[in-house]
Interface confidence: low
Amino acid sequence: MIPTFTALLCLGLSLGPRTHMQAGPLPKPTLWAEPGSVISWGNSVTIWCQGTLEAREYRLDKEESPAPWDRQNPLEPKNKARFSIPSMTEDYAGRYRCYYRSPVGWSQPSDPLELVMTGAYSKPTLSALPSPLVTSGKSVTLLCQSRSPMDTFLLIKERAAHPLLHLRSEHGAQQHQAEFPMSPVTSVHGGTYRCFSSHGFSHYLLSHPSDPLELIVSGSLEDPRPSPTRSVSTAAGPEDQPLMPTGSVPHSGLRRHWEVLIGVLVVSILLLSLLLFLLLQHWRQGKHRTLAQRQADFQRPPGAAEPEPKDGGLQRRSSPAADVQGENFCAAVKNTQPEDGVEMDTRQSPHDEDPQAVTYAKVKHSRPRREMASPPSPLSGEFLDTKDRQAEEDRQMDTEAAASEAPQDVTYAQLHSFTLRQKATEPPPSQEGASPAEPSVYATLAIH
């Protein structure tokens, strides 16, 4: 079973280790990629595996390769190893895990790292209908069009730490375009967007990014952040540079940066509190329902993002945070067909200056079957039912017990035809002694 686009298209969201330990004598190592896990063709990438100071050797496995992919001796002080890919090609795209050996034996496998290559196909065209200039409260549809038929389309927003939406059409029913409607538009929708296209046979291979499209939202006074600028920096595109700069902020903008940051955090906390309150009420009201009747689950599997690069360089990963605008809980969705094979993942870092409202996508002239939409891979949390999870594990070379993925406290809520899945994660452990970010939450919305 192919990992979902939500999984591998968290541009740069290479999977970090979960905080829990698996059974076994040695803790699993951390696996990450620099400058990120989404790399354009021909560019170099370094995969890092970090274990313990007792590690004597590191080993990297690439899924579906018949043999171990690489082995390296540790770099001093022996707690990590470097695996270099001098020039990214299709052959390197895929799913990796690493192990380390200490005097007591081999470690557990790391959580998987999904290395995605862009530039495999010609770039699609991204346009806005009716116009990229939209008034707050109105509707706009972003249209991603490819020259040749593709079955997967992805919409990303620059400087957001995640892909906003992806759309996978019915198997075999390839499209030349995909629509990403946004309604009602708010100020947070403003910004620069790009889209990618891909074939379902390899979700690790993406097209070149489309040219950027800037969405200008006017007529909003409640927006706490500066209006989106018209200048587009193509250098900081969604491929090899972080989508969300975590480095230094110019001094002139530092105060404004923190104001925005604090504002976003406060709003996020308030919204999260409200959300949890509503969910608690829902849970109390629906206590009599059986698990099989519940439409959505809220679970808190342990999770953690990968560590920041030791050199303090820019990175793609960030702690996903709640990014749910109250008015955007699919309120605009009317008559959504329950079989639409669409999955959405909204994540936003506490550092992100550009929180993204939840939207949804549909394929023009298609009714994707739900069974054709791949279930989320571990990258987006294990939200598989028993059958799907087994199928996913069967696909993997290194099967891991699904027991650790069982939800602990499960609450249920019905949101129209959507399922809201909320997963708590922990911030990336700091290698530099910096104080960790606040624990954060992200939500995944999936049409059922």
Epitope: E57, A67, P68, W69, I85, T89, D91, R101
Partner: antibody, heavy 111, light 111 residues
């Protein structure tokens, strides 16, 4: 397919390079391994080169052999052969799961 | 350094019978299962039979089976055929290529 070449009679100390020419195999996808077998003896694992071009060697082989590759060949250099290096040398695809082998090339080291 | 001890060194079996070859590692292998089995006939390169301790290689009859984990591994040939007369080798991997090694081999004679 895999085809080894370069095997010949050499005197001790004379460097020798064996070449494994691959066809229909993408060396960007597969690690390659060298194995040898002295006459009437068992198999000996020499080392490998992975898809990024990093080589690894058996403990006994380190310093005595160098493995390198191009897009279509994998070379094994015997840096300073001794009579103990007389053997048939095989190249094989993959690392441990050696699923495709060449026919081998015979190296004889004699003074 | 990894040491793989193969037993017996030689075994004879009747057609239709069963042969069991053992391979014992001095240390637990990588992922407890990084062991392959090969068949080699005189004048030919080895042929992969089993990889990752128990997985049957493509095109290999199901009469061949592998089992074991950690340090103890077994190759079983059931319903032995005349064509099975050959030498059999295990190949284990512990760490970094330096300790990838073959067992000493077992000669199977079919009566």
């Amino acid at each position: 397919s895999l085809e080894e070449s370069g095997g010949r009679l050499v005197t001790p100390g004379t460097p020798l390079t064996l070449t494994c020419t691959v066809s229909g195999i993408d060396l960007n996808k597969y690690a390659m391994t060298w194995v040898r077998q002295a006459p009437g003896k068992g198999l000996e694992y020499i080392g490998f080169i992975n898809i990024v071009g990093i080589a690894g060697y058996a403990t006994w082989a380190k310093g005595r052999f160098t493995i390198s590759k191009t897009s279509t060949t994998v070379d094994l250099k015997v840096t300073s052969p001794t009579t103990e290096d007389t053997a048939t040398y095989f190249c094989a695809r993959n690392w441990i799961r050696l699923d495709l082998w060449g026919q081998g090339t015979l190296v004889t080291v004699s003074s | 350094e990894l040491d793989l001890t193969q037993t017996p060194a030689s075994v004879s079996a009747a057609v239709g019978g069963t042969v069991t070859i053992s391979c014992q590692s001095s240390e637990s292998l990588y992922k407890k299962n990084y062991l392959s089995w090969f068949q080699q006939k005189p004048g030919q390169p080895p042929k992969l039979l089993i990889f990752e301790a128990s997985k049957l290689a493509s095109g290999v009859p199901s009469r061949f089976s592998g089992s074991g984990s950690g340090t103890q591994f077994t190759l079983t040939i059931s319903d032995v055929q005349c064509d099975d007369a050959a030498s059999y080798y295990c190949l284990g991997d512990y760490t970094n290529g330096r300790d990838t090694t073959f067992g000493g081999g077992t000669e199977v004679v079919v009566k």
